[in-house]
Amino acid sequence: KESCDVQLYIKRQSEHSILAGDPFELECPVKYCANRPHVTWCKLNGTTCVKLEDRQTSWKEEKNISFFILHFEPVLPNDNGSYRCSANFQSNLIESHSTTLYVTDVKSASERPSKDEMASRPWLLYRHHHHHHHHHH
């Protein structure tokens, strides 16, 4: 049953809450068999995904999986939003689900909402910070 299709392992509704000013690595886990595909990141603007051309990216290779990483050095408030990775392989374009970054601005960190407030007010754009932690609702 082992398929040699390229797979991008970003789950639907995946989210990260991060703090402005911190470094952050957004990972796109990629499975491929022989030739590594060309992978890019884009940021969603409405229904359009705008390719991130001049951002620092890197590959991390592990035994059964590779990661195409988008680096935030550091995270800025306007990095808030949804991102998608795409792989080009043998003329096929494979797109991942989007993953959302919720950026808390350090300037308002002292006024950040509590966990309880967050639970009762999920519409808040800026989330309480848990570095590298995934939130799912």
Partner: antibody
Framework: QITLKESGPTLVKPTQTLTLTCTFS??????????VSWIRQPPGKALEWLAH???????RFNPSLKSRLTITKDTSKNQVVLTMTNMDPVDTATYYC?????????????WGQGTLVTVSS | DVVMTQSPLSLPVTLGQPASISCKST???????????LNWLQQRPGQSPRSLIY???KLDSGVPDRFSGSGSGTDFTLKISRVEAEDVGVYYC?????????FGQGTKVEIK
């Protein structure tokens, strides 16, 4: 060979908590893309998805039952456990666990044999 | 929730003849990633479900090629080109595009 097998009580009383275990072999739940779901089927009725746990311990629940459900995994034992609180006779069903494989998204490619749970006093 | 509606609910078929089952969803199953997460299961009498087709038309391993899937958006079809005795059972479509994942009510295929 991939197999999944459900185990747990066949009879529970109303208001009690149901604990079901899915023991699987032939794959690892730590592998990217892998997951396990619980799905139930009341007698003579259609299937209803309950909960899913992913390779990285991320979880998803059916919102209509979320407050009653927990799902956990023990990768070393190849087990996934579902608990459902406050059982009611309408929860009488065959409960299946299924492997979630991945092709851009989860699909269920292997199913357990199912275990019939009756809720009655 | 996305409601999946199958028709017919009962399908008497003649051995060796084709059969077709329709599945309609209340929302488009085309995902923003460009894929359509519509799947089909077979449940033979007294057995647990078995995966037949995923991503609208991909046959799962070990599934005979007399089965095929087609469709897009909200309208999907499962076809059996020549029904065999072992095809008797209930067929379910289900969607994995929107949470919660939801199933059709099932179509019972029986031999005339």
């Amino acid at each position: 060979q991939i197999t999944l097998k459900e185990s747990g009580p066949t009879l529970v009383k109303p208001t009690q908590t149901l604990t079901l275990t899915c023991t699987f072999s032939g794959f690892s739940l730590s592998t990217f893309g892998m997951g396990v779901s619980w799905i139930r089927q009341p007698p003579g009725k259609a299937l209803e998805w309950l909960a899913h746990i992913y390779w990285d311990d991320d979880k998803r629940f059916n919102p209509s039952l979320k407050s009653r459900l927990t799902i956990t995994k023990d990768t070393s034992k190849n087990q996934v456990v579902l608990t459902m609180t406050n059982m009611d006779p309408v929860d009488t069903a065959t409960y299946y666990c299924a492997r979630g494989n991945w092709d851009g998204e989860t699909y269920f490619d292997y199913w357990g044999q199912g275990t019939l749970v009756t809720v009655s006093s | 929730d996305v409601v999946m509606t199958q028709s017919p609910l009962s399908l008497p078929v003649t051995l060796g003849q084709p059969a077709s089952i329709s599945c309609k969803s209340t929302q488009s199953l085309l995902d923003s990633d460009g894929k359509t997460y519509l799947n089909w299961l077979q449940q033979r009498p007294g057995q647990s479900p078995r995966s037949l087709i995923y991503l609208v038309s991909k046959l799962d391993s070990g599934v005979p090629d007399r089965f095929s899937g087609s469709g897009s958006g909200t309208d999907f079809t499962l076809k059996i080109s020549r029904v065999e005795a072992e095809d008797v059972g209930v067929y379910y479509c289900w969607q994995g595009t929107h949470f919660p994942w939801t199933f059709g009510q099932g179509t019972k295929v029986e031999i005339k």
